[in-house]
């Protein structure tokens, strides 16, 4: 036990326990303390101290056993690499400072793998990748000796196994024992060597969790399954059979602290709606504990694989629930998980076996009652038949990611009960909770779901096209007449979709320039395609000056776009990538989801505007109900519409309409803004539904919006659901699945 | 010169055991697994298993499971291969190989071969 | 298990032309991480013990001839004689080693046409 539960509060005096360079905090109502130094700074010799039923603070001890009289502030070090094989690295040093460089050679023959050069990062790591030096010859390659560990083996042949170990004070994480297995693949995890003042940043954190989560949740055909010696990109296999299990495990002891409990909320909201956003439908389970635990969703429980209700009964949980009893019990905590895993009368279900299972349990790393819960992993592993086999080891069914947050982890007991795959991270320690908010919201952002439509990083450090990233920004050069703006979106990685009136028939490639991403180079435009029955003058014979009908045009680049965090595409209907987003089976049909993105009534859209350089969402209502024909009706204020007597002449079932003061005052288009999307944003993700083409009023004479706006001021958009088979045609070779 | 160097020729009866012989010279001998391959008359090769020479440690093809037996003898640089309840299909030129170093995987050094004959 | 299967059974060239062995797995030999595919060659003459000719798929064992090469990776691959002499009258065979047991192809018998 760290310490006692029953001793009174705030029994320790605070007199001597500063930190010189640094300051001090209190934790757990007095109890404990954590040092709090700058920026590239380390508390010297401990990070934490609690406060002993002597009455006294734990004596500051340093790593060899010396006890300290006063704490301080220290510079941190990165530490240096013990050995390296087959080659030479320079500078040699004892120890470097933060922002030092080290660089890595290999002898003749031999090739080097990972970072060449790394830095000495302000956390304490070295930036890169573990470099090495291989010749090649083995049966598997060279594990390699991560910085700060050292190694025993030097034979790579199949079944030769390594292991790792680290200096005094320091904490292994990772695998200590590797072997090489069939395939050329090692078992368990790159290690390193943690001082307790180190910690995941945000970004690292995102990146790992995200790459090996996509690895269990990225469905690929049934066929795929390769053996034990398996290295292609570790895939579950979602096949119609199969299915997932997600165990969310929240501490709820005294240790965590009320605000930390409801951060630790927010975190697997968002993890629910990312693991959603792939278009998987696993079975939730929900524990949260403290002395005992308490289960909230049952996997068995027929709501628990809808994300929606699962989401509610996660925002309903009260940290106070566990006041009374606010012990840490994690071995208790995993049996619940166990109960939930296990079968009635121990006799297997059809297909048990075809279960994947992804526990994420979010702790302080402190239990302190009920026993080591490792021994509670090994029977989930035993449950589950996984590692019994050696041809079918079936470690893919059991993931185990554990998050440590706070300075009073204990990485040996976090670092126990996580999974170890190879190239994979499943035990993690942040700082703290807004760090840990920190990841769940950059795991929106991670090169495996960049393919994902209508996804955006909707963080507080986002720019305007990570909150936009579909944007495109178009203007075509006319020489001697000026240039002409225009928006476009991102629909694949060769296509921008924008209105067709942007161009004229003489307007050439050279002279379209195209940006996406905020970059500001140009792309390379290959062809301008317009939709056939567009006409701008084809009812001039009328007294119809401009007629905008089907006013769409694609736009193919010469070049791929490189997806990434400000360049993404925007869903497009009647599209697989869309049935995904929208959550919808994959039976869903196209009229399916016209009925769920543009029911018959006023339907909440938005539109992206350029305003002083900065892109805005303006949001708008489609009129598809009751207002619609009194919104269509306006379309005779505009200019050059005045003598039209029937005004579908002019607003064809093309177009959709909105604008006007009801059922609320609707910002408008300005003439910059035609050939962007007209968006529907539902369940955090963003389906264009039209094409902005023009507009009654143009309210911003002047390059300003005016404010003041008439009711009739009204814009039309083109509708995509009624231009399909032409983005089908046109779009065929791109990957979106259309239906 | 790196040299492996097999036991005679074998004829055996259906049902009875056989132990062929490779003794290594011209390397450290635990250095290096030992694998041992079979060819049947005119046909294909076969994989049975390896020893490594350091540990005693042992793999078989499943195929071979509960009927063959590798052991070695560092005294005297040996690797053995008993195969019991022998068959008429068991009749095959075995070999022992070396593989390198690093890798045991690819057969860079041969014994001369052992035929073993399984006739009643 | 994976199963290795070569083509021709035989196959007879001219001295000096090109002679082409391939050789299919029922599954991928290349780790992906490693780019390496678990593939040799081998060659046997009458009455010999088996003899290296190529690992890692396209790496010649020292000491053999440069008119041998092996290519291909993942499921397909290629062993090329690119100027027959009278000594390459042989079997071959292919090798996988990603997963065990490690299996053989059937062989391919080289002969002078």
């Known amino acids: 036990t760290p310490w006692s539960l029953a001793r009174p509060q705030g029994s320790c005096s605070l007199e001597g326990v500063e930190i010189k360079g640094g300051s001090f905090r209190l934790l757990q109502e007095g109890q404990a303390l954590e040092y709090v130094c700058p920026s590239g700074f380390y508390p010297y010799p401990v990070q934490t101290r609690t406060c002993r039923s002597t009455g006294s603070w734990s004596t500051l001890k340093t790593q060899d056993q010396k006890t300290v009289r006063k704490a301080e502030c220290r510079a941190i070090h990165c530490p240096r690499p013990h050995d390296f094989e087959n080659g030479e690295y320079w500078p040699r040093s004892p120890y470097y400072n933060v922002s030092d460089e080290i660089s890595f050679h290999c002898y003749d023959g031999y090739t080097l793998r990972g970072s060449a050069n790394r830095t000495c990062q302000v956390n304490g790591r070295w930036s890169g990748q573990t470099a090495i030096c291989d010749n090649g010859a083995g049966y598997c390659s060279n594990p390699g000796i991560p910085i700060g560990t050292r190694k025993v083996g030097s034979q790579y042949r199949l079944e030769d196994s390594v292991t790792y170990h680290c200096s005094r004070g320091l904490t292994l994480r990772g695998s200590q024992r590797r072997t090489c297995q069939e395939g050329g693949s090692w078992s368990g995890t790159e290690p390193s060597c943690q001082d307790s003042f180190m910690y995941d940043t945000p970004q690292e954190v995102a990146e790992a969790f995200l790459s090996s989560l996509t690895e269990t949740i990225e469905g690929v055909d049934a066929e795929d399954g390769h053996g034990p010696g398996e290295q292609q990109k570790r895939k579950i296999v979602l096949d119609p059979s199969g299915s997932m299990n997600i165990y969310l495990v929240l501490d709820g002891s005294d240790s965590i602290g009320a605000s930390n409990f409801t951060g630790a909320k927010k975190c697997l909201v968002n993890l629910i709606e990312k693991v959603a956003s792939y278009g998987v439908k696993p079975r939730y389970g929900l524990v949260t504990y403290a002395t005992y635990p308490k289960i909230w969703v049952k996997v068995s429980e027929a709501d628990s694989s809808n994300a929606d209700w699962v989401t509610k009964q996660l925002n309903e949980i009260n940290y106070e629930d566990h006041k009374l009893k606010s012990g840490t019990n994690t071995k208790k905590a995993l049996q619940a998980v166990y109960s939930m895993m296990s079968w009635p009368d121990d006799v297997p279900p059809e297909g048990w076996n075809r279960t994947r299972h992804v526990i994420i349990l979010m702790t302080d790393g402190l239990h302190n009652m009920g026993g080591d819960p490792i021994t509670v992993i090994d029977e989930i592993r035993d449950l589950l038949y996984i590692g019994k086999d050696r041809k079918n080891p079936r470690e893919d069914y059991l993931d185990v990611y554990v998050f440590g947050v706070g300075p009073l982890v204990n990485q040996v007991n976090i670092n126990a009960l996580a999974s170890k795959k190879d190239n994979e991270q499943h035990v993690f320690k942040v700082k703290d909770m807004e760090n840990l908010e920190d990841v769940f919201y950059q795991m929106i952002d991670e090169s495996q779901s960049l393919s994902l439509c209508g996804m955006v990083w909707e963080h507080r450090k986002g720019t305007d096209y990570h909150k936009q990233p579909w944007q495109a920004k178009i203007s075509v050069i006319r020489p001697s007449k000026g240039h002409e703006s225009c928006m476009g979106a991102v629909v694949s990685e060769y296509f921008v979709l924008t209105a067709a009136h942007c161009f004229t028939v003489d307007d050439k490639e050279h002279s379209i320039k195209v940006s996406v991403g905020g970059e500001k180079r140009d792309l390379e435009i290959e062809v301008v395609l317009f939709h056939p029955n567009y006409n701008i003058n084809g009812k001039k014979e009328a007294g119809i000056p401009e007629f905008y009908d089907y006013d769409v045009a694609l736009i193919k680049l010469k070049n791929k776009l490189k997806y990434g965090q400000t360049i993404r595409p925007i869903c497009l209907p009647c599209t697989e990538g869309t049935t995904r987003a929208l959550r919808l089976p994959p039976t869903t049909t196209c009229q399916q989801q016209k009925e769920e993105l543009l029911p018959a009534q006023d339907i909440k859209a938005l539109f992206v505007s350029e305003e002083e350089k900065k892109l805005t969402r303006k949001e708008v209502y489609i009129k598809n109900g009751d207002k619609k024909g009194s919104c269509e009706r306006d379309a005779q204020y505009a200019p050059g519409y005045d003598k039209v007597k029937d005004i579908s002449e002019v607003v064809t079932p093309r177009f959709l309409c909105t604008g006007g003061v009801s059922p609320y005052a609707d910002p408008n288009t300005c003439r910059g803004d035609s050939g962007g999307p007209l968006i529907v944003h539902k369940r955090s993700r963003f389906i264009q539904v039209g094409v902005i083409s023009w507009g009654v009023v143009d309210v911003c004479k002047n390059q300003k919006r005016q404010k003041q706006v008439p009711a009739h001021a009204r814009d039309f958009h083109i509708n995509l659901f009624q231009v399909l088979p032409w983005l089908k045609e046109k779009l065929q070779d791109e990957d979106l699945g259309f239906l | 010169e790196v040299q492996l160097v097999q036991s005679g020729a074998e004829v055996k009866k259906p049902g009875a055991s056989v132990k062929v012989s490779c003794k290594a010279s011209?390397?450290?001998?635990?250095?290096?697994?030992m694998t041992w391959v079979r060819q049947a008359p005119g046909q294909g090769l076969e994989w049975m298993g390896w020893?490594?020479?350091?540990?005693?440690?042992?793999k078989y093809a499943q195929k071979f499971q509960g009927r063959v037996t590798m052991t070695r003898d560092t005294s005297i640089s040996t690797a053995y291969m008993e195969l019991s309840r022998l068959r008429s299909d068991d009749t095959a030129v075995y070999y022992c190989?070396?593989?390198?170093?690093?890798?045991?995987?690819?057969?860079?050094?041969w014994g001369q071969g052992t035929l073993v004959t399984v006739s009643s | 298990d994976i199963v290795m299967t070569q083509s021709p059974d035989s196959l007879a060239v001219s001295l000096g032309e090109r002679a082409t062995i391939n050789c299919k797995s029922s599954q991928s030999v290349l780790n992906s991480r490693n780019k390496k595919n678990y593939l040799a060659w081998y060659q046997q003459k009458p009455g010999q013990p088996p003899k290296l000719l190529i690992y890692?798929?396209?790496t010649r064992e020292s000491g053999v001839p440069d008119r041998f090469s092996g290519s291909g990776s993942g499921t397909d691959f290629t062993l090329t004689i690119s100027s027959l002499q009278a000594e390459d009258v042989a079997v071959y065979y292919c090798?996988?080693?990603?997963?065990?047991?490690?299996?053989f192809g059937q062989g391919t018998k080289l002969e002078i046409k």
């Open positions: 190989a070396r593989g390198y170093y690093a890798n045991s995987a690819w057969f860079a050094y």
């Open positions: 020893i490594n020479p350091n540990s005693g440690g042992t």
């Open positions: 090798k996988q080693v990603y997963n065990l047991p490690w299996t």
């Open positions: 011209g390397y450290s001998f635990t250095d290096y697994y």
């Open positions: 890692w798929a396209s």
